[in-house]
Amino acid sequence: ALDAAYCFRNVQDNCCLRPLYIDFKRDLGWKWIHEPKGYNANFCAGACPYLWSSDTQHSRVLSLYNTINPEASASPCCVSQDLEPLTILYYIGKTPKIEQLSNMIVKSCKCS
Amino acid sequence: ALDAAYCFRNVQDNCCLRPLYIDFKRDLGWKWIHEPKGYNANFCAGACPYLWSSDTQHSRVLSLYNTINPEASASPCCVSQDLEPLTILYYIGKTPKIEQLSNMIVKSCKCS
């Protein structure tokens, strides 16, 4: 799986999970989140050669097409596969609220 | 939706469905499919600016991050959303066979 256990331990030019820390204020301009100040969002990037973590029949076909027609612009792309929520603390007036924001953290990637 | 109805009628640099005809013999080296000789596989390509057909909370966060940090390499990618099967005719000896290959045609795209 193109997850942290694999991608963070291997130098990999192909599609893989990449570390990305996002600071809510600095990087997103969000001042309303009290805790955490930021989080490990991660992201997916890298090449999608033939059969590298191909997600569907179409992505396999597209990577085979790309192998035979390397000048073509049509190729699969490295995107998130498994995502996890992030629990945040914010205030409405003086009342603290805890909320879970869904699909905030990328845990693994795929070629789609 | 970033489908043919929208994308094929608009000049769109952003993520959209793009036409791609694949000839089985020429483009994939597949000689076993009798009919069709090829098909409109289509593919997804284009930029994913902030909120352009974002698929998840993470892709929204990433596109916002990319807006504020344009030099960063982290950005969402344009990939297939809805896929459809393709019905093919091939032969086993002299016996014709009809089969449905799943997820062969891209119908719409998203930023993920």
Partner: antibody, heavy 118, light 108 residues
Framework: QVQLVQSGAEVKKPGESLKISCKGS????????VAWVRQMPGKGLEWMGW????????RYSPSFQGQVTISADKSISTAYLQWSSLKASDTAMYYC???????????WGQGTLVTVSS | SYELTQPLSVSVALGQTARITCSGD??????AHWYQQKPGQAPVLVIY???DRPSGIPERFSGSNSGNTATLTISRAQAGDEADYYC??????????FGGGTKLTVLG
């Protein structure tokens, strides 16, 4: 039903040539690759190479490149593995297997035992 | 070329769960497939692609992978599951490789 039927056992002397066969039936022969796998006595499986019968493209394991030749005749749905000069170390069971271009062997032949001894 | 590493043997009590691992540098991105071979017989595909089972293979057989390790899990192990198990994978030019094989023994 899908079948891969291999030629019978062979006993040869070192230096002799040999060509064994694998006939596919019950499926479109050019749709799938045919791979060859060696299993020496009491040992594991070793991938030797594959052929795409539709295009005659081949790929060999570095360990077997130049040692064997893989070919196919799609008109009779048959793949071949051949040696020009056998060695005692070629003594093994040889399997052919059907392989989709996505990388797995879904049907196997029954195996051909090749014994090379002086 | 690359290598896939498997334990030489794994033992499991009858009815319990057996796990056979396969590790290799390529397994992050290229899927592992699993084959069962009983003495005197040709290998049989038991898991392919991400974790798919061919028809006829019981649901007790499942596959997963994390990091560069693929795992074949056999739940509710039966005496008939005793066999050698091989993982296999490939690269983008479809150069294939097999693991060294794991002998599964079902005790009891």
């Amino acid at each position: 039903q899908v079948q891969l039927v291999q030629s019978g056992a062979e006993v040869k002397k070192p230096g002799e040539s040999l060509k064994i066969s694998c006939k596919g039936s019950g499926y479109s022969f050019t749709r799938y690759y045919v791979a060859w796998v060696r299993q020496m006595p009491g040992k594991g499986l070793e991938w030797m190479g594959w052929i795409d019968p539709g295009t005659s493209n081949t790929r060999y394991s570095p360990s077997f490149q130049g040692q064997v030749t893989i070919s196919a005749d799609k008109s009779i749905s048959t793949a071949y593995l051949q040696w020009s000069s056998l060695k005692a170390s070629d003594t093994a069971m040889y399997y052919c297997a059907r392989m989709l271009a996505w990388g797995w062997f879904d049907y196997w032949g029954q195996g051909t035992l090749v014994t090379v001894s002086s | 070329s690359y290598e896939l590493t498997q334990p030489l043997s794994v033992s499991v009590a009858l009815g319990q769960t057996a796990r056979i691992t396969c590790s290799g540098d390529n397994l992050g991105g290229y899927y592992a497939h699993w084959y069962q071979q009983k003495p005197g017989q040709a290998p049989v595909l038991v898991i392919y692609d991400k974790s798919d089972r061919p028809s006829g293979i019981p649901e007790r057989f499942s596959g997963s992978n994390s990091g560069n390790t693929a795992t074949l899990t056999i739940s509710r192990a039966q005496a008939g599951d005793e066999a050698d198990y091989y993982c296999a994978s490939y690269d983008s030019s479809l150069m294939m490789v097999f693991g060294g094989g794991t002998k599964l023994t079902v005790l009891g």
